[in-house]
């Protein structure tokens, strides 16, 4: 009953493959910063395995990570984001398998939001216009966005722009016309912090113009 | 509201055992680590036992190590010491305590019972 | 294992006083840090943690400063209820430490 594993159990797990990869959101919920992590094989067998960072924390050395299914993961307000931290895999007492990491070199920016495109007919272009809570943010505020859109037929032939406004202009002429489009947005950090590309924002879907259509707002279907 | 009733204490012989127990209610026991804390009669605090939100962790300061065992029944919504090999040095008032942060390992207490009694003499 | 000093260990003082009560730590606890009240007979009561934020529904007389490994917890002024004994706590690492204890007595 003392919260060890018995050698029998750890005699299995060090057979089994235990890489797992984390990331982190700064200011996540308010001034909160979160740290996610799981395992990349999904039938490693997670009953008695627990997370556990350590260093580059203020107020505790160690901090369990709070279990949810399959994911793993801490909400605090306690990293320090200078150095790195040593985050493992442990059974018991006994570490399994460490990885050390920075965690403002992990970074996945919250999903864009609020897209939406405007057709304006005297100039015969789309603004695209989307929002980010990362303008609000005192860490992560400079991104990098990846906006895709694709005419909804061409299922994968997906067209990307690179940005780092929110807002982008789209010519008339590089669209086909009378044709509905799919658009969305991601981000990813850019400048001192380092990491993964968000989530896609939702899609926004707007249809073009016939050539000699005098519409006004390109409406969302 | 948050309530926990340790139970269990009493007087033991040099060398003897005893199990100590800690009702809780009014918040959910898986969501944080607990604690035993003890003090001897006219003296300080002294940190017993720490488990883990899961039960999976447990810590000792070396004074109690290999004697005490420190466990949970999350479904009983209950704690438990069992304490081996006593000494009269551990004679003292026993508190459980919960942390104010649930589960990541913050290790303040905003919740203690009201202690039981453990001493220990022949 | 981190060494909690705390001073005075006992002190008098009379209502309104200003009173200052330090715990030094054996190495840096990065502020984690806790302070407790305990009168007899009663179990302790979380003031302060995280080295200087005071718990919901503690009077804001109380105060609590520090960093590395020296800490300070102040009464700006001491009210009839104050008299008490006073306990530091690191949380920073296992083994948890509590410091020795101050008794606050009325002069």
């Known amino acids: 009953e003392s919260g060890y594993a018995q050698n029998g159990d750890l005699e299995d797990a060090e057979l089994d493959d235990y890489s797992f990869s984390c990331y982190s959101q700064l200011e996540v919920n308010g001034s909160q910063h979160s740290l996610t992590c799981a395992f990349e094989d999904p039938d490693v067998n997670i009953t008695n395995l627990e997370f556990e960072i350590c260093g580059a924390l203020v107020e505790v050395k160690c901090l369990n990570f709070r279990k949810l299914q399959e994911i793993y993961f801490i909400e605090t307000k306690k990293f320090l984001l200078i150095g790195k931290s040593n985050i493992c895999v442990k059974v018991g007492e006994k570490s399994l398998t460490c990885k050390k990491i920075d965690l403002t070199t992990i970074v996945k920016p919250e999903a864009p939001f609020d897209l939406s495109v405007v057709y304006r007919e005297g100039a015969n272009d789309f603004v695209v216009t989307f929002n980010t809570s990362h303008l609000q943010k005192k860490y992560v505020k400079v991104l990098m966005h990846d906006v895709a859109y694709r005419q909804e037929k061409d299922e994968n032939k997906w067209t990307h722009v690179n940005l780092s406004s929110t807002k982008l202009t789209l010519l008339q002429r590089k669209l086909q016309p009378a044709a509905m489009y799919e658009i969305k947005v991601r981000s990813i950090p850019d400048h001192y912090f380092k990491g993964f590309w968000s989530e896609w924002s939702p899609s926004y879907y707007f249809r073009t113009p016939e050539i000699n259509n005098s519409s006004g707002e390109m409406d969302p279907i | 509201q948050v309530q926990l009733v340790e139970s269990g204490g009493g007087l033991v012989k040099p060398g003897g055992s005893l199990r100590l127990s800690c009702a809780v209610s009014?918040?959910?026991?898986?969501?944080?680590?607990m604690a035993w804390i003890r003090q001897a009669p006219g003296k300080g605090l002294e940190w017993v036992s720490t488990?883990?939100?899961?039960?999976?962790?447990?810590y000792y300061p070396d004074s109690v190590k290999g004697r005490f065992t420190i466990s949970r029944d999350n479904a009983k919504n209950s704690l438990y010491l069992q304490m081996n090999s006593l000494r009269a040095e551990d004679t003292a008032v026993y508190y459980c305590?919960?942390?104010?942060?649930?589960?990541?390992?913050?290790?303040?207490?905003?919740?203690w019972g009201q202690g039981t009694l453990v001493t220990v003499s022949s | 294992d981190i060494q909690m000093t705390q001073s005075p260990s006992s002190l008098s003082a009379s209502v309104g006083d200003r009173v200052t009560i330090t715990c030094r730590t054996s190495?840096?606890?990065?502020?984690?840090l806790a302070w407790y009240q305990q009168k007899p007979g009663k179990a302790p009561k979380l003031l302060l943690y995280?080295?200087?934020t005071l718990h919901i529904g503690v009077p804001s007389r109380f105060s609590g400063s520090g960093s590395g490994t020296d800490y300070t917890l102040t009464i700006s002024s001491l009210q009839p209820e104050d008299f008490a004994t006073y306990f530091c706590?690191?949380?920073?690492?296992?083994?948890?430490?509590f410091g020795g204890g101050t008794k606050v007595e009325i002069k």
């Open positions: 305590a919960r942390p104010l942060s649930a589960h990541y390992g913050f290790n303040y207490f905003d919740y």
């Open positions: 009014g918040f959910t026991l898986s969501d944080y680590y």
């Open positions: 488990i883990s939100a899961s039960g999976l962790r447990t």
């Open positions: 190495e840096d606890i990065y502020q984690g």
């Open positions: 995280s080295a200087n």
């Open positions: 706590q690191q949380y920073y690492d296992y083994p948890l430490a």
